[in-house]
Every structure is written in C-alpha cells, then in structure tokens.
C-alpha cells in the first residue's frame, strides 16, 4: 500500500455520527466501512480531520439532510467545508446550499463538496452546517474524507 | 502513464446505458469519452467495476434523474454506491437522496457520490437506484468511475 | 511535494468570478484559497484550465445557483464540464441538471460534477451553464479544478 517509506499513502473516510451537541460542526466516527490509512491523518474530537504532512489534498464531504420549507428558517440549508490551520483563523474552503423542500414532513436532499487544497502540517478540516438536527445519519448518507495527492 | 511496472495507474470512467432489465442496478458501457486504464479494472456484465489489486480507491458516481412527486412513490429517489467483495454480501458505501420534484412532467435533479475505500482483489462496486426508469442517459448526465490512489 | 522531477504533482483549484460577459462559459480566478501547483496547468483567459502533459486527470466543478421557476425558462439549470482538445471540436464530459426552485425570490441549489478523463497536451477544460446570471459567487459556492493521477 505504500508509495515508499518517505511517501506513504494518506487517506481518510469517516462516517457521520448523530450528536446531542448544539454545535453546527458535524460529528464523525471511525465506524462502518471507514478508512484511516495511518497516523498521518487523524480524526480529532470526532469533528476534524488533521494532517501531519504538508501537501496537496483532495478533500470532500457529503451531507444528506431532510428539511421542510415551512418548518425551517427562510435561509437555505448550507454545508461548509472549513480549514483551521495552526495559528490562523478558520476559513471556508467550499460551500453548497440547497433551498428547503416543500415535501412533508420533510424532503431529503444530498449535497456533495470536493476540491484540491494545500494543507500545512497540523491543519484541520471540518464540516459545518446551518442545522445539524436536519442531517441524515442512515448508512452511507453523510460522510467526510480526504486523500493526499 | 505508468507510476512504474509494479504500480501502474488504475482508473475507470464508464457511461450510463439505458436498460430494459427491471433490476435496480444501473447499467454502464465503455462508450463515448470513457476511461479504462488497463485490465486491472474491468467492467463486468455492464453493471460493476471490478478491481484486481487490493488498495485504496476513490470511487464516484453521478446520477441524473427526472421525477415527479405525484407520479412517484412517496419515498425519495435514492442512489447507492455498493461494494460486493468475493464471498460476502453487498454493502452500502455511500447513498444520496433527493425528494421528487413538483415540476411537470418531471423535474431533473443530479446526485453525486464519492469517497475513499479499501478494496480487496476481486471486489466489485456498482450503483443501485430506487427507480432506474427515471435515470437520464443524455450525454454526460450519468456516469461511474474510480481511481486507485 | 514532487513525485519526482519527471513526474511532478499537477493540480488546480480556481474560484468563480462574476462576469459582465454574456457568454455561458463561467469565469474563474486565482484568488482566495486557490491552488495552482505549477506551470503544467494554467488558467487561460479566466475561463479554461489547460494542461501541458498527457495523462489521466480527475476533473471536477461545483456550481451553486439561485433560480425561480416562474422567472426562469421551463428548461432546467444545466452545468456542463466540457473538453477542448487541440484541433478538435469541444465535447461534453459531464453534465448535471436541476429543476428551478419555487422559492422566492429564488432558491439556491448546488451541483457537483467530477470524473476521470484522459487529456492530451494542450487540452483545455471549461464549465458551461444555461444561465450564468443565476450563479452564486459567494465564498466557496462555485469552484473548478483538476488533479493529475
């Protein structure tokens, strides 16, 4: 599986976890058919993927949610892929927005985010949503990962 | 194109094919602007991508469909990316769900799935949908692929 | 960051730019948290990513748009990832379609496209949409990139 001792494969894929926390940051777990290639990428506090090596990474997230226009705020459901580098403020890398469905009790929709970004050693990426209570945690619906190029 | 004789590039991208079969598993073809890097990944029976080498793969699928809320079941349209390893039951890797549109005669929507997974030699991946008759097969709308890290 | 002098990493991620042009081809910029690995991939005329080396590339685009069914044409919003190879006509690689929302003044939706394709030296990829005036250019909403396998 190694590209070489100096250049091991680095990849992760983690699975959404329902949380009683009121934070807008989604929670993840190493469960089900997850991937964690080695200790050069780690899941920290169940909320962020942290990398040890600088480089270019393809980072992705998928969020499925169920919402209803009448029961939700007027603002759309937004999922954001965010970066926190050591000693810096967090920043948004990617966002996707979907207007709430008129289906009752709620209408399911899926969002996919993905892009190539330079990460510094110790950088963390995480996923933020407008309303975590609307996120679907059934098998395969919501996940988060990265791979080093 | 080779990373080296021992580590060739492995990648595939196949194109959706309309099928008269009643199965919920989507059918694919090596047509149009498809990719099939070498015989270390193959399209089997027009329905599954099978790999010969163990390793981490980024696997993706895109499905565009056209449906109407009144003409469809109450359940949403769901696309599932599934894994079938030799001697094991299939398992769901990724799913996405979209509630049917109220547009008439039908409203188009696109789903994208993607993630990093460990595959064993002989493992196959395939795409399952709730209603294959709703899938759009126009150029570029529905496709399926993978790449080995 | 190099795979070796003969095999450098090639990747790009560019950010959407609002344009006064009436063209349906989206405009991009090297701004914000963008990626441009080296001169083996370039952003030309703010509209296309051009590669110097032949090979397999994972190419992706994300487009967020805001539209309303009554104010739009009956046709859905379609985003197309297109290829222009030297001496050849352009061709569609990937497309996604989303029916317009009934939300007012408009409903946001996000589209993600991605796939593995063989590119020739000098090949360019670009993104075309049915109505560029509906595209959302807020931070992270609309982006475009590629990575060489």
């Amino acid at each position: 599986m190694q590209k070489g001792d100096q250049n091991p494969q680095i990849a992760a894929h983690v699975i959404s976890e329902a949380s009683s926390k009121t934070t807008s940051v989604l929670q993840w777990a190493e469960k089900g058919y997850y991937t964690m290639s080695n200790n050069l990428v780690t899941l920290e506090n169940g909320k962020q993927l942290t990398v040890k090596r600088q480089g270019l990474y393809y980072i992705y997230a998928q969020v499925t949610f169920c919402s209803n226009r009448e029961a939700s705020s007027q603002a759309p459901f937004i999922a954001s892929l965010c970066l926190k580098s050591p000693g810096r403020f967090e920043r948004i890398l990617l966002r996707a927005a979907n207007t709430h469905s008129s289906a009752k009790p709620c209408g399911q929709q899926s969002i996919h985010l993905g892009g190539v970004f330079e990460l510094q050693p110790g950088a963390s990426v995480f996923v933020n949503v407008t309303d975590p209570s609307q996120v679907s945690h059934g098998t395969g619906f919501t996940s988060f990962g990265l791979l080093k190029l | 194109m080779q990373k080296g004789d021992q580590n060739p590039q492995i990648a595939a991208h196949v194109i959706s094919e309309a099928s008269s079969k009643t199965t919920s598993v989507l059918q694919w073809a090596e047509k149009g602007y498809y990719t099939m890097s070498n015989n270390l990944v193959t399209l089997e029976n027009g329905k599954q991508l099978t790999v010969k080498r163990q390793g981490l793969y980024y696997i993706y699928a895109q499905v565009t469909f056209c449906s109407n809320r009144e003409a469809s079941s109450q359940a949403p349209f769901i696309a599932s990316l599934c894994l079938k390893s030799p001697g094991r039951f299939e398992r769901i890797l990724l799913r996405a769900a979209n509630t049917h549109s109220s547009a008439k005669p039908c409203g188009q929507q696109s789903i994208h799935l993607g993630g990093v997974f460990e595959l064993q030699p002989g493992a196959s991946v395939f795409v399952n949908v709730t209603d294959p008759s709703q899938v759009s097969h126009g150029t570029g709308f529905t496709s399926f692929g993978l790449l080995k890290l | 960051m190099q795979k070796g002098d003969q095999n450098p990493q090639i990747a790009a991620h560019v950010i959407s730019e609002a344009s006064s042009k009436t063209t349906s081809v989206l405009q991009w910029a090297e701004k914000g948290y963008y990626t441009m690995s080296n001169n083996l991939v370039t952003l030309e005329n703010g509209k296309q990513l051009t590669v110097k080396r032949q090979g397999l590339y994972y190419i992706y685009a994300q487009v967020t748009f805001c539209s309303n069914r009554e104010a739009s044409s009956q046709a859905p919003f379609i985003a197309s990832l297109c290829l222009k190879s030297p001496g050849r006509f352009e061709r569609i690689l990937l497309r996604a379609a989303n029916t317009h929302s009934s939300a007012k003044p408009c409903g946001q939706q996000s589209i993600h496209l991605g796939g593995v394709f063989e590119l020739q030296p000098g090949a360019s990829v670009f993104v075309n949409v049915t109505d560029p005036s509906q595209v959302s250019h807020g931070t992270g909403f609309t982006s475009f990139g590629l990575l060489k396998l």
Epitope: G32, Y33, G138, T139, G140 | T23, S24, V25, S80, C82, L83, S85, G87, R88, F89, E90, R91, I92, N128 | -
Partner: nanobody, 124 residues
Framework: EVQLLESGGGLVQPGGSLRLSCAAS????????MSWVRQAPGKGLEWVSS????????YYADSVKGRFTISRDNSKNTLYLQMNSLRAEDTAVYYC?????????????????WGQGTLVTVSS
C-alpha cells in the same frame, strides 16, 4: 433498540402455502443482510435462507430450494418468506435474523439479532 417481529405462522395442510413476515426496527434495515432460520421440535437450529441488503442476491438451504422464496421490502422495513408445497418436515419455529454488514455469504450462524419466532405447523 433493534427489534425483529415475526408473524404469519399457523397451521397448514401438506402441500399448502404460508407467507411469513418480519417487521424490523431500530436499525437501517436496507444496509443489512437478513436470514430466516428455523428450529424443529427437539432439533437444533437450521438455516433456511438469506437475502442481501438490496435484495439482489438470495441463498437457500437445499431442503427448501425451489419451494421457498425470500424477499424484502426496504421501504417497509420488512422481510418475507413465501413458503409453498409445505411438508410435515417444515414444521418448526421460524426466526428472522439480522446479519452484520458485509457478512460472509456462506456463514449462516453469525447473527447479530433474532426475533421471537413464529410457529409453523404442517399437518393434515
């Protein structure tokens, strides 16, 4: 909490038919393989049939092949067993059982959860 509730058992004459149902709750039904297992009076457990999560693959014990059909309706979280051409030797308590995700197809006793069972009696 995972729950499996069988129904549809009863008394039937040889050559007759029955349809068993198993209502599942407390887990993502469509993500898991499911099985039917039976226990005849005074005998050990016998695996009857299994079905893959999406219903794409089915497996049967030789003793029921061609007579029994396993199926599932993932939208209703329900597993079924259609039993035709019933014989006296099919008399047993029939249990619905959940397998782990990605379980091996030829291992029939590694069940995560069981129902309480429904009695099928084949007698004239």
């Amino acid at each position: 909490e995972v729950q499996l509730l069988e129904s549809g058992g009863g008394l039937v004459q040889p050559g007759g038919s029955l349809r068993l149902s198993c209502a599942a709750s407390g887990f993502t039904f469509e993500a898991y393989p499911m099985s039917w297992v039976r226990q005849a009076p005074g005998k050990g457990l016998e695996w009857v049939s299994s079905i893959s999560p999406l219903g794409l693959w089915t497996y049967y014990a030789d003793s029921v092949k061609g007579r029994f059909t396993i199926s599932r309706d993932n939208s209703k979280n329900t597993l079924y067993l259609q039993m035709n051409s019933l014989r006296a030797e099919d008399t047993a308590v029939y249990y619905c059982a959940k397998l782990s995700a990605g379980a091996e197809t030829h291992v029939y006793r590694l069940f995560d959860y069981w129902g309480q069972g429904t009695l099928v009696t084949v007698s004239s």
